[in-house]
């Protein structure tokens, strides 16, 4: 039975040219996290594997940095980075948990962080 929940940074916004940290946190389960995938639509950005370490997709290596923790830092943001991001937690024995973050990249300096929320 999957009892865990993923808490994410929710809906966030950031300035064009700036950077943003995407964070998810898995709680309420004793399952072992074996891997976390960070994906944008169908594109893989990065993987943090408990045994293999971090892998950043070649097409993102200049703009993506691992961490902090299991999170991901996006740098040199463009308006094309606006969209949904998913953290996919592979756990044992529970299975897979998925969290969603919506990032809006703004042209001006009106960017603010949205509220945190939970995805069961």
């Amino acid at each position: 039975m999957m009892t865990g929940t993923i808490e994410t940074t929710g809906n966030i916004s950031a300035e064009k040219g700036g950077s943003i940290i995407l964070q998810c946190h898995l709680s309420s389960t004793t399952a072992q996290v074996t891997q976390v995938n960070w994906e944008q639509q169908d594109q893989l950005l990065a993987i943090c594997n408990a045994d293999l370490g971090w892998h950043i997709s070649p097409s993102f290596k200049d703009r993506v940095a691992p961490g902090p923790g299991l999170g991901l830092t996006l740098q040199s943001l463009t308006v094309n980075d606006t969209g949904e991001y998913f953290c996919i937690y592979h756990t044992y024995p529970d299975g897979t948990y998925t969290g969603r973050i919506f990032l809006e990249v703004l042209e001006s300096s009106v960017a603010e962080h949205g509220a945190r929320f939970q995805i069961p």
């Epitope: 074996t34 993987i47 293999l52 070649p58 592979h90």
Partner: antibody, heavy 118, light 107 residues
Framework: QVQLQESGPGLVKPSGTLSLTCAVS?????????WSWVRQPPGKGLEWIGE???????NYNPSLKSRVTISVGKSRNHISLKLSSVTAADTAVYYC???????????WGQGTLVTVSS | SYELTQDPAVSVASGQTVRITCQGD??????ASWYQQKPGQAPILLTY???TRPSDIPDRFSASSSGDTSSLTITGAQAEDEADYYC??????????FGGGTKLTVL
């Protein structure tokens, strides 16, 4: 220099269990390193079977997962492979291999042919 | 079936340049590694990463990638390059996948 030496029965009966051992020398099982098994049926291509990490965690080819067990020997310089319920389709040269992190296989054993036949 | 697709056979005249390709969705997220295998021998690693060769691999072997395709180029193919060539990568579940192999004939 890393050396990998596979050993085990060259003939296994159908429905039986294939058991192979890989003797590892020149390197210790260390953080970030993994040990894997790859097979190659006669005249065909390479197929990854699975791997084991320093932590003891394993990762298996989904198509073989229900039949495969990879483990580290008590002496920690041997890796073992067990493949259950074998059929003639499991006849292959079995290679013990190693690598580190997300990098590819960088060392291979010389391989050992296992034939499944009654 | 293989998740990475290779042409089964390719031929090249001695001294000429040949390109062996590998296609698959995982190559959008992972660089391919390339292996050479001669009859009765274990494979050896030729290239990995963006285009890195182990120190004992001749520089006539090089790799490149674009989109979902990785290529191994042999510049000035020699008779001893006649072999089977396999591409490999991880997938997003951290599984290792291999291509079906390409048999290179040097004429």
């Amino acid at each position: 220099q890393v050396q990998l030496q596979e050993s085990g029965p060259g003939l296994v009966k159908p429905s039986g269990t294939l058991s192979l051992t890989c003797a590892v020398s020149g390197v210790s099982i260390r953080q970030g390193h993994w040990w894997s098994w790859v097979r190659q049926p006669p005249g065909k291509g390479l197929e990854w079977i699975g791997e084991i990490y320093q932590t003891g965690r394993t990762n298996y080819n989904p198509s073989l997962k229900s039949r495969v067990t990879i483990s580290v020997g008590k002496s920690r310089n041997h890796i073992s492979l067990k493949l259950s319920s074998v059929t003639a389709a499991d006849t292959a040269v079995y290679y013990c291999t190693t690598g580190s992190g997300w990098y590819p296989i960088d060392y291979w054993g010389q391989g050992t042919l296992v034939t499944v036949s009654s | 079936s293989y998740e990475l697709t290779q042409d089964p056979a390719v031929s090249v005249a001695s001294g000429q340049t040949v390109r062996i390709t590998c296609q698959g969705d995982s190559l959008r997220s992972f660089y391919a590694s390339w292996y050479q295998q001669k009859p009765g021998q274990a494979p050896i690693l030729l290239t990995y990463g963006k285009d890195t060769r182990p120190s004992d691999i001749p520089d006539r072997f090089s790799a490149s990638s674009s989109g979902d395709t990785s290529s191994l180029t042999i510049t000035g193919a020699q008779a001893e390059d006649e072999a089977d060539y396999y591409c490999s990568s991880r997938d997003r579940s951290a599984n290792v996948v291999f291509g079906g192999g390409t048999k290179l004939t040097v004429l």
